[in-house]
């Protein structure tokens, strides 16, 4: 058992049929010695008397807010939450597995540049009685500071019969060094509590591995005289690290016909312009990726050929 | 050339070769479904590799002030990885495929280190740790880890040379 916050405790339970559970001793926070009774949640049923109450915590019915009283007056409370371990694995019932980039991905994080700022998000189908706290650091044995803002509800989607809620948080490394080669990963830890269930989720990554630039900006077409060719030009996204001579991007230019089945023409270039053939009803798209490290491509920026 | 006396390297040549190194490092170990090698335990194996750190002067300002510190750091790393790629971690079982880019990668690391430090000049080099995994599967895992680490190292080196070629070339 350990304290999550003042008077809120997490009981770690091996979860299997007929498991013995955990013996927990609660102590009433009072100088009083006698005439003390204990109740659970809103029930008035007396569970025991005396300054301490010993309970065997086996299931969610044993968790909740324990209150000690004397003569109708509340003396103190303790809230017990459960953290389930099944077959040696902590439960992950609260958040949804996003399965990207691999199974058991509950927290996904992305960075638009090397500034040390990143965003993480997670999904749940639970709407009410749900709380989160978020912590982050660089490294775990001698952690360096990362400051996270508020975890906010960033999207709601309907998925079949279920509503899905997306929460996101922005974090910033306190002393970021954009040009350095990271040797210690960023750690992100999310504590989630749903009703009386406690779970924790972690993600560990290097900023370089979660880089996803914004799409190129100011994508423009300039027809070339007496030709079906056009010059496509674009610029680095505003959010990308500077100077661009150091933090360089590479680009993929794609010509796509109206039908998805039509063959796509693709060119790769380090420049911010390219010459392509513009087919009728086609569109031209450009996306960006770090030139020297194969992290994610940006989303496409597109313009119609016409 | 980045001789210890402090003259400039052939920035454009270094840029081209370091960009080639990036390509080779990724073709030697493409990112297979974000295989997270940090989960595989065994941290100490790649903790000893030289990293380009914050105080090494490899940022744009540091390069403008005095590129020698950074170039020396890069040189140390190139020699270190060149030795690792020539060690029994890569030459032992399981054998690399004949068309594996690791051979080219090894040669290019040597090429870039020689561009930075011609014969007869000597910068300190870092001691290579004695990593002799006994099992083929340990060797395979170590190869992956080394290549992942090398990808990060050469990315920073390539940025340095690209920026140098664009802003510091005579």
């Amino acid at each position: 058992i350990w304290e999550l916050k003042k008077d809120v405790y997490v009981v770690e339970l091996d979860w299997y049929p007929d498991a013995p559970g955990e013996m927990v001793v609660l102590t009433c926070d009072t100088p009083e010695e006698d005439g003390i009774t204990w109740t659970l949640d809103q029930s008035s049923e007396v569970l025991g008397s005396g300054k301490t109450l010993t309970i065997q915590v086996k299931e969610f019915g044993d968790a909740g807010q324990y209150t000690c009283h004397k003569g109708g007056e509340v003396l103190s409370h303790s809230l017990l939450l459960l953290h389930k371990k099944e077959d040696g694995i902590w439960s992950t019932d609260i958040l949804k597995d996003q399965k990207e980039p691999k199974n058991k991905t509950f927290l996904r994080c992305e960075a638009k540049n090397y500034s040390g700022r990143f965003t993480c998000w997670w999904l749940t189908t639970i709407s009410t009685d749900l709380t989160f706290s978020v912590k982050s650091s660089r490294g775990s044995s001698d952690p360096q500071g990362v400051t996270c803002g508020a975890a906010t509800l960033s999207a709601e989607r309907v998925r079949g019969d279920n509503k899905e809620y997306e929460y996101s948080v922005e974090c910033q490394e306190d002393s970021a060094c954009p040009a350095a080669e990271e040797s210690l990963p960023i750690e992100v830890m999310v504590d989630a509590v749903h009703k009386l269930k406690y779970e924790n989720y972690t993600s560990s990554f290097f900023i370089r591995d979660i880089i996803k630039p914004d799409p190129p900006k100011n994508l423009q077409l300039k027809p070339l005289k007496n030709s079906r060719q056009v010059e496509v030009s674009w610029e680095y996204p505003d959010t990308w690290s500077t100077p661009h001579s150091y933090f360089s991007l590479t680009f993929c230019v794609q010509v796509q016909g109206k039908s998805k089945r039509e063959k796509k023409d693709r060119v790769f270039t380090d420049k911010t312009s390219a010459t392509v053939i513009c087919r009728k009803n086609a569109s031209i798209s450009v996306r960006a990726q770090d030139r020297y490290y194969s992290s994610s491509w940006s989303e496409w920026a597109s313009v119609p050929c016409s | 050339r980045a001789v210890p006396g402090g003259s400039s390297p052939a920035w454009t040549q270094c840029q081209q070769l370091s960009q080639k190194l990036c390509t080779l490092a990724w073709s030697a170990h493409p990112l297979v479904g974000h295989m997270d090698l940090r989960e595989e335990g065994d941290e100490e194996t790649t903790n000893d590799v030289p990293h380009i750190q914050c105080g090494d002067g490899c940022d744009p300002q540091g390069l403008r002030d005095n590129s020698q510190f950074c170039l020396q750091r890069i040189h140390q790393g190139l020699i270190f990885y060149e030795k690792l790629l020539g060690s029994d971690i890569f030459t032992g079982e399981p054998s690399l495929l004949p068309d594996s880019p690791v051979g080219q990668l090894h040669a290019s690391l040597l090429g870039l280190s020689q561009l930075l430090q011609p014969e007869g000049h000597h910068w300190e080099t870092q001691q290579i740790p004695s990593l002799s995994p006994s099992q083929p599967w340990q060797r395979l895992l170590l190869r992956f880890k080394i290549l992942r680490s090398l990808q990060a190292f050469v990315a920073v080196a390539a940025r340095v040379f690209a920026h140098g070629a664009a802003t510091l070339s005579p």
């Epitope: 809230l79 749900l130 803002g149 508020a150 975890a151 929460y167 | -």
Partner: nanobody, 125 residues
């Protein structure tokens, strides 16, 4: 120093309506769940209603569902409890609570970090 100040409590006839307000100062709670709890004489403090940081998710105790509505105005750092069809059993001191956590909030009062002094609501029959 964080302060939550409740207002709007008074004596009202059964079937009547009241609107409670809770103004927060000392920090903003625009991303944090806030809620109302109540305590009747000789009883434990019980959950009434909670609202998420952006106001999009609300949760009510079964005893007040359909009669009470919780809302918030983040620009004013204030939450409200509109109480309709009041019953004598709604008589209690109503407390405003704010959490330092995120999400949609908890029905357990120990999960809240900041509390107001309370405002008395008395419903006469």
């Amino acid at each position: 120093e964080v302060q939550l100040v409740e207002s709007g409590g008074r004596l009202v006839q059964a079937g009547g309506s009241l609107r409670l307000s809770c103004a927060a100062s000392g920090r903003t709670f625009d991303s944090n769940p806030m809620g109302w709890f109540r305590q009747a004489p000789g009883k434990k403090r019980e959950f009434v209603a909670i609202i998420s940081g952006n106001g999009g998710i609300t949760n009510y105790a079964n005893s007040v569902k359909g009669r009470f509505t919780i809302s918030r105005d983040n620009a004013k750092n204030t939450i409200y409890l509109q109480m309709n069809s009041l019953k004598p059993e709604d008589t209690a001191v109503y407390y405003c609570a704010a959490s330092g956590l995120y999400g949609s909030g908890s029905v357990y009062d120990l999960m809240y970090d900041y509390w107001g002094q309370g405002t008395q609501v008395t419903v006469s029959s």
